[in-house]
């Protein structure tokens, strides 16, 4: 009961940390910017992954999409790169997992199957959450970087003069959203990890049990059948049955739950 | 790096109407101002005319009803019309641009200048 429930808890928290990695690669709002001491209006700008937007105090808001790949920065490639593997990997995770569920019977599947299903999906889930958390540390670096190589810096180039324009830029949305979201998917990639130990079906072997008849003293193996296909402990091909010919070694080689005197 | 290329300036009776363009070009995400800057021989550099992406303006008080600022998003080109002309006028016409160049960098971009001359 308890292993369902770990396996079922983990399968929720990572399908949210899921979508909330989603959300986060999505979101426009990685970094914000207020640009102050402006003559014109007042500017919100914010920038995702995937497109630059610029919000004015009128409301009116334009974004636009990095179209090119090569002129983007080499920080950013790998941002995307990073939370589109953690997305994938966590899609994939999740269609393993659904089919590892305890609570879903699907034919004659047994539960060592499931067992590992569980493992493989939970491995997937804490890659996921640790390549969205990469990702999002990655790109609030390269903020921090920005702002510190940002300061006092003023060049003259072929169209006049440029300087860079102190503003603050801070966390967007986003970062938190991903940080978050890439937690929960390694949480529940552990209870996965975690429910499969509990999954895993336990190797009961009861190597041999001697019964001491008055008559003929018959030493009586379970596991003769499976000797025959391959099954069990009696890989030799011994003789089960041996009429009682047999050294006392032979007879108490394995120690035994039952034994009958 | 941000470029900007300053077009349209020139010699021109009092009375008479000029246009001015900026255009900017290099690694821009986004321009969320566009505008123009004058700075007469002696005096301090002031603001002629700005306009953001969503096409607020502002205009310096000198030039209301005179100059009409207006920009093409999709050129990134900032343009000045500037009809009745005065000899006060005179001065050297700087673009400025707001720009964001990358993740977490704002560019503030000056134009080299171009000379306006209003004279009869």
């Known amino acids: 009961m308890a292993v369902t429930a770990c396996q079922g808890l983990g399968f929720v928290v990572s399908l949210i940390g899921i979508a909330g990695i989603i959300a986060a690669t999505c979101m426009d709002q990685w970094s914000t910017q207020d640009l102050y001491n402006n003559p014109v209006t007042a500017v919100f700008n914010y920038q995702g992954l995937w497109r630059s937007c610029v919000r004015e105090s009128s409301g009116f808001t334009e974004c636009r999409g990095y179209f090119t790949l090569l002129g983007l920065p080499a920080m950013l490639q790998a941002v995307r790169a990073l939370m589109i593997v953690g997305i994938v990997l966590g899609a994939i995770g999740l269609l393993v997992s659904i089919f590892a569920l305890k609570c879903i019977r699907i034919g004659s599947m047994e539960d060592s199957a499931k067992a590992n299903m569980t493992l493989t999906s939970g491995i997937m889930f804490i890659v996921s959450g640790l390549c969205a958390i990469a990702g999002v540390s990655v790109f609030a670096n390269m903020l921090v970087t920005n702002f510190w190589m940002s300061t006092a810096n003023m060049y003259t180039g072929m169209g006049g003069m440029v300087q860079t324009v102190q503003t603050r830029y801070t966390f967007g949305a986003a970062l938190f959203v991903g940080w978050v979201a890439g937690g929960l998917t390694l949480i529940g990639g552990v209870m996965m990890c975690i429910a499969c130990r509990g999954l895993a079906p336990e190797e009961t072997n009861y190597k041999a049990v001697s019964y001491h008849a008055s008559g003929h003293s018959v030493a009586y193996k379970p596991g003769g059948f499976k000797a025959s296909t391959g099954f069990g402990s009696n890989t030799k091909n011994k003789k089960i049955y041996d009429g009682g010919a047999r050294t006392e070694d032979e007879v108490q080689s394995y120690p035994s739950k039952h034994d009958y005197v | 790096q941000v470029q900007l290329v300053e077009s349209g300036g020139g010699l021109v009776q009092p009375g008479g109407s000029l246009r001015l363009s900026c255009a900017a070009s290099?690694?821009?995400?986004?321009?969320?101002?566009m505008g123009w800057y004058r700075q007469a021989p002696g005096k301090q550099r002031e603001l002629v005319a700005g306009?953001?992406?969503?096409?607020?303006?502002n205009y310096g008080d000198s030039v209301k009803g005179r100059f009409t600022i207006s920009r093409d998003n999709a050129k990134n080109t900032v343009y000045l019309q500037m009809n009745s002309l005065k000899p006060e006028d005179t001065a050297v016409y700087y673009c400025n641009v707001l720009v964001v160049s990358g993740i977490g960098s704002t560019l503030e971009v000056w134009g080299q200048g171009t000379l306006v001359t209003v004279s009869s």
């Open positions: 290099g690694s821009i995400f986004n321009i969320p101002v």
């Open positions: 306009i953001s992406t969503g096409g607020t303006t």
